[in-house]
């Protein structure tokens, strides 16, 4: 009778085991072990027992002890069970960003591991078990579907294998995959709202605002604002589930024409974009041209108003005839025209919007000098010893210099308060002089003496 010890062994893969083959007869003709495993016999006294060291056990095996005794041949098998933890425990790769409301399929693949009867695959969210299944197939695959929720944001999903050898007197061996961190997001189907000027003048600045509500997590949203090829650098303000990106846009003559303004919001692996056109225009203020800004009285003056070729102008409120970018008027300069404003108003339609510009010029009319009865009376009669202010106003542009002299030497104090004396009496020659010429006027002062009774 042949026996083997131990009859059952569980050992780690690549491990070694001592197997004892025994026989019940004292003088067996043969006693040995049959196995494909590398073996080494340990020398022992006696003929009816042999010990073998079996090494590098890679898979389950059933070495067989045999003996040949006088009463016949017999065999006994030992059962070697190899255990090893899986070589690969992996979650199938997934995009880290997943939209809320999507059904997400988690797939765990397990390669290797034995004994399979003791191997279980567990899918987890954090520490919460989602699914537990025995490992079947090579590679073993376990799947589960998760409906992505907002509160799953940042959750770690993992896959764990459990090789439970506790019933065999060993421990529970666990292997865990690298975690998959889920980033959940909500990007609404509505495109971002873009508020910007429809038209923008060259060498000016405009403000562009792009905003969107209903985002999650809003802090992860990327905003790209651009005008044509010019990337704008917005200041982004975040709300609970909204953002507002504000940027200044400067345009130059090179940008003139219709440009595309874009606002793109990227969140997770999705994006929403809004496009708008902005018309960049150049519109210098209209030109008011006077033949001469300063003319003498009686001179013919042409006032011209010129604007952008597509503009429509009015000159002093009168539309150009025909309607267009030029208007003019002719006038003979009079003193009343001195300081007169000529205003040219231009309207330019840019992409349906009306832009208004204005320019004003003043005409200077040189005239005079003038001395007339109204402003310089020819006769004054004043009581002696009274307080009087001689008044004589000369008119003209430029303002004339005025002197009133009696006998060429004695001045009349114009505009000053004086006590009337006999010396003041007489005829004065008032002379008004400017670059435009000279006029004279005689002014007589009569002094009334008081009557003594």
């Amino acid at each position: 009778q042949t026996s083997v010890s131990p009859s059952k062994v569980i050992l780690p893969r690549g491990g070694s085991v001592l197997v004892t083959c025994s026989t019940s007869c004292d003088q067996p003709k043969l006693l040995g072990i049959e196995t494909p495993l590398p073996k080494k016999e340990l020398l022992l006294p006696g003929n009816n027992r042999k010990v073998y060291e079996l090494s590098n056990v890679q898979e389950d095996s059933q070495p067989m002890c045999y003996s040949n005794c006088p009463d016949g041949q017999s065999t006994a098998k030992t059962f070697l069970t190899v255990y090893w933890t899986p070589e690969r425990v992996e979650l199938a790769p997934l995009p880290s960003w997943q939209p809320v409301g999507k059904n997400l399929t988690l797939r765990c693949q397990v390669e290797g591991g034995a004994p399979r009867a003791n191997l279980t695959v567990v899918l987890l969210r954090g520490e919460k078990e989602l699914k537990r299944e025995p490992a079947v197939g090579e590679p073993a695959e376990v799947t589960t579907t998760v409906l992505v929720r907002r509160d799953h944001h940042g959750a770690n999903f993992s896959c764990r294998t459990e090789l439970d050898l506790r019933p065999q007197g060993l421990e529970l061996f666990e292997n865990t995959s690298a975690p998959y961190q889920l980033q959940t997001f909500v990007l609404p189907a509505t495109p971002p709202q873009l508020v910007s000027p429809r038209v923008l003048e060259v060498d000016t600045q405009g403000t562009v605002v792009c905003s969107l509500d209903g985002l999650f997590p809003v802090s992860e949203a990327q905003v790209h604002l651009a005008l044509g090829d010019q990337r704008l650098n917005p200041t982004v303000t975040y709300g609970n589930d909204s953002f507002s990106a504000k940027a200044s846009v400067s345009v130059t003559a090179e940008d003139e024409g219709t440009q595309r303004l874009t606002c793109a919001v990227i969140l997770g692996n999705q994006s929403q974009e809004t496009l708008q056109t902005v018309t960049i225009y150049s519109f210098p203020a209209p030109n008011v041209i006077l033949t001469k800004p300063e003319v003498s009285e009686g001179t013919e003056v042409t006032v011209k108003c010129e604007a952008h070729p597509r503009a429509k102008v009015t000159l002093n409120g009168v539309p150009a005839q025909p309607l267009g970018p030029r208007a003019q008027l002719l006038l003979k300069a009079t003193p009343e025209d001195n300081g007169r404003s000529f205003s040219c108003s231009a309207t330019l339609e840019v992409a349906g919007q009306l832009i208004h510009k204005n320019q004003t010029r003043e005409l200077r009319v040189l005239y005079g000098p003038r001395l007339d009865e109204r402003d310089c009376p020819g006769n004054w009669t004043w009581p002696e010893n009274s307080q009087q202010t001689p008044m004589c106003q000369a008119w003209g542009n430029p303002l004339p210099e005025l002197k009133c002299l009696k006998d060429g030497t004695f001045p009349l104090p114009i505009g000053e308060s004086v006590t009337v004396t006999r010396d003041l009496e007489g005829t004065y020659l008032c002379r008004a002089r400017s670059t435009q010429g000279e006029v004279t006027r005689k002014v007589t002062v009569n002094v009334l003496s008081p009557r003594y009774e």
Partner: antibody, heavy 123, light 110 residues
Framework: QSVEESGGRLVTPGTPLTLTCTVS????????MSWVRQAPGKGLEWIGI??????TYYASWAKGRFTISKTSSTTVDLKITSPTTEDTATYFC???????????????????WGPGTLVTVSA | AYDMTQTPASVEVAVGGTVTIKCQAS??????LSWFHQKPGQPPKRLIY???TLASGVSSRFKGSGSGTQFTLTISGVESADAATYYC????????????FGGGTEVVVK
């Protein structure tokens, strides 16, 4: 000075229709002209405008559905490219250009309207 | 875009009373605003232009005011002939996609 629309009639959906606006007493080379419509019992709805130089602008809902063109110095057309029952309305043509003598600026203002022409779209 | 919001949508007023209609622009339109009224079967008729200037032949009972974004039309001493739908219209822009008219206010005279 006057404005008058013509061409309104009963059409089947999808049949293109052209309305004409005829002006007298002024020239279209000096004015912008707008088309406005009004569905039965509804408010005024601006369709689009044509400038003195022939540039056109449209309301967002009207783009691609309507075409405004100048056919002479006294006529402007509105083409409804593929009418639907929703296009049933009275269509008005209005002079849409004014200037303010105090500032000297031009602005949009519908100061002169036609009596309107009725378009009925029905199968 | 220049959105024009008109309030109220409808108002009832007794003969001799006063009615106020408001029009709000989403962006400044300076004073480029006109008011119209329209009676059934007729084209609109301009009452006021440049926010406050009375169109020729229009009764001085109609008064327009405001600038920028807020505008008001006031009808005082209401007559039965004033029963109509009133519209505001911005004169600042006719860009693509623009809103030109307010939604309208129906004035019912009792």
């Amino acid at each position: 000075q006057s404005v008058e629309e013509s061409g309104g009639r009963l059409v089947t959906p999808g049949t293109p229709l052209t309305l004409t606006c005829t002006v007298s007493g002024f020239s279209l080379s000096d004015y912008y002209m707008s088309w406005v419509r009004q569905a039965p019992g509804k408010g005024l709805e601006w369709i689009g405008i044509i400038s003195d130089s022939g540039s056109t602008y449209y309301a967002s809902w009207a783009k691609g559905r309507f075409t405004i063109s100048k056919t002479s110095s006294t006529t402007v057309d509105l083409k409804i490219t593929s009418p639907t029952t929703e296009d049933t309305a009275t269509y008005f043509c209005a002079r849409d250009w004014s200037y303010d003598s105090s500032s000297g600026y031009y602005y949009y203002d519908m100061d002169l309207w036609g009596p309107g022409t009725l378009v009925t779209v029905s199968a | 875009a220049y959105d024009m919001t008109q309030t109220p949508a409808s108002v009832e007023v007794a003969v001799g009373g006063t009615v106020t209609i408001k029009c709000q622009a989403s962006q400044s339109i300076n004073s480029w605003l006109s008011w119209f009224h329209q009676k059934p079967g007729q084209p609109p008729k301009r009452l006021i232009y440049k926010a406050s200037t009375l169109a020729s032949g229009v009764s001085s009972r109609f008064k327009g005011s405001g600038s920028g974004t807020q505008f008001t039309l006031t009808i005082s001493g209401v007559e039965s002939a004033d029963a109509a739908t009133y519209y505001c219209q911005q004169g600042y822009s006719r860009s693509d996609g623009e809103h030109v008219f307010g939604g309208g206010t129906e004035v019912v005279v009792k």
